[in-house]
Amino acid sequence: GSGIFQLRLQEFVNQRGMLANGQSCEPGCRTFFRICLKHFQATFSEGPCTFGNVSTPVLGTNSFVVRDKNSGSGRNPLQLPFNFTWPGTFSLNIQAWHTPGDDLRPETSPGNSLISQIIIQGSLAVGKIWRTDEQNDTLTRLSYSYRVICSDNYYGESCSRLCKKRDDHFGHYECQPDGSLSCLPGWTGKYCDQPICLSGCHEQNGYCSKPDECICRPGWQGRLCNECIPHNGCRHGTCSIPWQCACDEGWGGLFCDQDLNYCTHHSPCKNGSTCSNSGPKGYTCTCLPGYTGEHCELGLSKCASNPCRNGGSCKDQENSYHCLCPPGYYGQHCEHSTLTCADSPCFNGGSCRERNQGSSYACECPPNFTGSNCEKKVDRCTSNPCANGGQCQNRGPSRTCRCRPGFTGTHCELHISDCARSPCAHGGTCHDLENGPVCTCPAGFSGRRCEVRITHDACASGPCFNGATCYTGLSPNNFVCNCPYGFVGSRCEFPVGLPPSFPWVA
């Protein structure tokens, strides 16, 4: 502990200028004081001033008022510092002396004489309030006040609690009157060394080094560090824990970048046609009558379906068509005949057969001719056999499809992929993805094109279940399981009913 007993001398009265022994001072009593502070004694005794002692210079002659003085010689109040826990009780002896000698250091002069003395014993609590008193004897009167205060940085009832305000990384606080710490705004903890993070900052996933901050731990993001960061490259997926990539509905693959539901996501089929998914990014459009093209985007003329029979000619109208019938035929589609076999209605060598007791007929056409009267040469392109926008061309009795770039096959039904040039080395499997081909590598190889030989084979331990194929070089775990139909999971360990058209890459 550490504190100061302060004694303020206010007025000393010795009107007759007398000493304690009854003699008078000549020319007057040049007065200084000796103060002795010690532990409480019921009966004050001589002996060491255990709490401290102090002397003053000459403060006046006979009777005088003592002015406050903050520094130098004759300081008032008098200071009696102590370096222990203040016990709350004390004994104080104040002696007034006359000196014939030096004003500044009368204590050292020979021939000093006692004028009077007072003794105070009692209790005194630490505090800023001065206790005022006055002591009289037959010849003199002394007015004074006193108190005990704690030294700088000491607090509490007995000045025993050391506290120094600080604002560094070992504490951010001020000191309360009792010596306890009062944290500065934004700080908490026993030593006020823990910052109070931004309100709502996630307790586990965020932290701070100064108040109102929220620094995210690896794998977390957002103002409050409550959003996980998905796996790098995760396209159509989310996470519940960091570095995860849980695919949104209709997406698959390690990075959820393989579209399993192209129809729903992109609606590629136009004009009311039906869209059917067929694996990653694959789909087919089934057109309504009157439309053609890969996406059924091409509208056919209303006459394109050749609705007029028996050689009738078709004329397009705004929302319909009109059949101009040849002689001997009538009806919306010229389907009704006024002719009989006697009129030789069958062309191109067709045979006439009478029907309805000769009131009508039917023609049996030779090869390569069709129509009610065998009037039409067979057009093998009528059924729109060419897929993906291919152009149909009649070649005598047969027809061929002229495919658009990127398609092949008899009906242009095959997509020529980036994988056609076999970019994957060492037997890697090629997958056409939006941004180009991706190789899944066999055991022992990795890299974009399976060109890197792996010295440590992550697949050697056989981590994939249920007959899945193991590949390395595609994931941070060093291996990837390509699941067979009916199984999912990072190791293909979970059975589930999945469409057989797309093998899951776990």
Partner: antibody
């Protein structure tokens, strides 16, 4: 009982980077009661505080060295490290790692045995 | 930058009291620590927060700090106390050591 052990090369060439690691055993570096510091002592001279770090990664550096010093922490390994770049012969010293206690007002109650690093070509 | 000044050396007879001072501007408003370092050894904390002793440090080591001066007192000095002594304080977020005092037990 907590012990600290410095490790790293004893010889570094001028203009290169000095790298030291302090491994803490017998206690967790993630304690909220301590900072982990580096102090150096050139031969025959006094102690110089370099800087310290908290387990969260908060760092404090001596302004006279700040431009060249990096202190980092790896809680998974219970280690913290010092990097001092562009060294000169004046950086030759015994380098100590130490534990500074928040309850001790910043006093360093545990020290490593020190490792002498000489900067010379 | 903040500086702490110590006398380069202090001599003391066995059994006597050695006082080592450490001066710095308004040092009394900061907490002072003291370290003992013997030749070829790491420093050892002997006083923290001006006057507190870590466990294992003998009672003959005591400290005080007020005004501009912190003092380490070794009462009843023993030959084993011969060592270099460093004061240390924190100036904001920077640790500052005194230049060190060599205590010789005569």
């Amino acid at each position: 009982e907590v012990q600290l052990q410095e490790s790293g090369p004893g010889l570094v060439k001028p203009s290169e980077t000095l790298s030291l690691t302090c491994t803490v055993s017998g206690g967790s570096i993630s304690s909220s009661s301590y900072y982990w510091g580096w102090i150096r002592q050139p031969p025959g001279k006094g102690l110089e505080w370099i800087g310290d770090i908290y387990y969260t990664g908060s760092t404090y550096y001596n302004p006279s060295l700040k431009s060249r010093v990096t202190i980092s922490v790896d809680t998974s390994k219970n280690q913290f490290s010092l990097k001092l770049s562009s060294v000169t012969a004046a950086d030759t010293a015994v380098y100590y790692c130490a534990r500074e206690g928040v309850p001790l007002g910043g006093g360093a109650d545990k020290w490593g045995q020190g490792t002498l690093v000489t900067v010379s070509s | 930058s903040y500086e702490l000044t110590q006398p380069p050396s202090v001599s003391v007879s066995p059994g006597q009291t050695a006082s080592i001072t450490c001066s710095g501007q308004r040092l009394g408003d900061k907490y002072a620590s003291w370290y003992q370092q013997k030749p070829g050894q790491s420093p050892v904390l002997v006083i923290y927060e001006d006057s507190k002793r870590p466990s294992g440090i003998p009672e003959r080591f005591s400290g005080s700090n007020s005004g501009d001066t912190a003092t380490l007192t070794i009462s009843g000095t023993q030959p084993m106390d011969e060592a270099d002594y460093y004061c240390q304080a924190w100036d904001r977020d920077t640790g500052v050591f005194g230049y060190g005092t060599k205590v010789t037990v005569l």
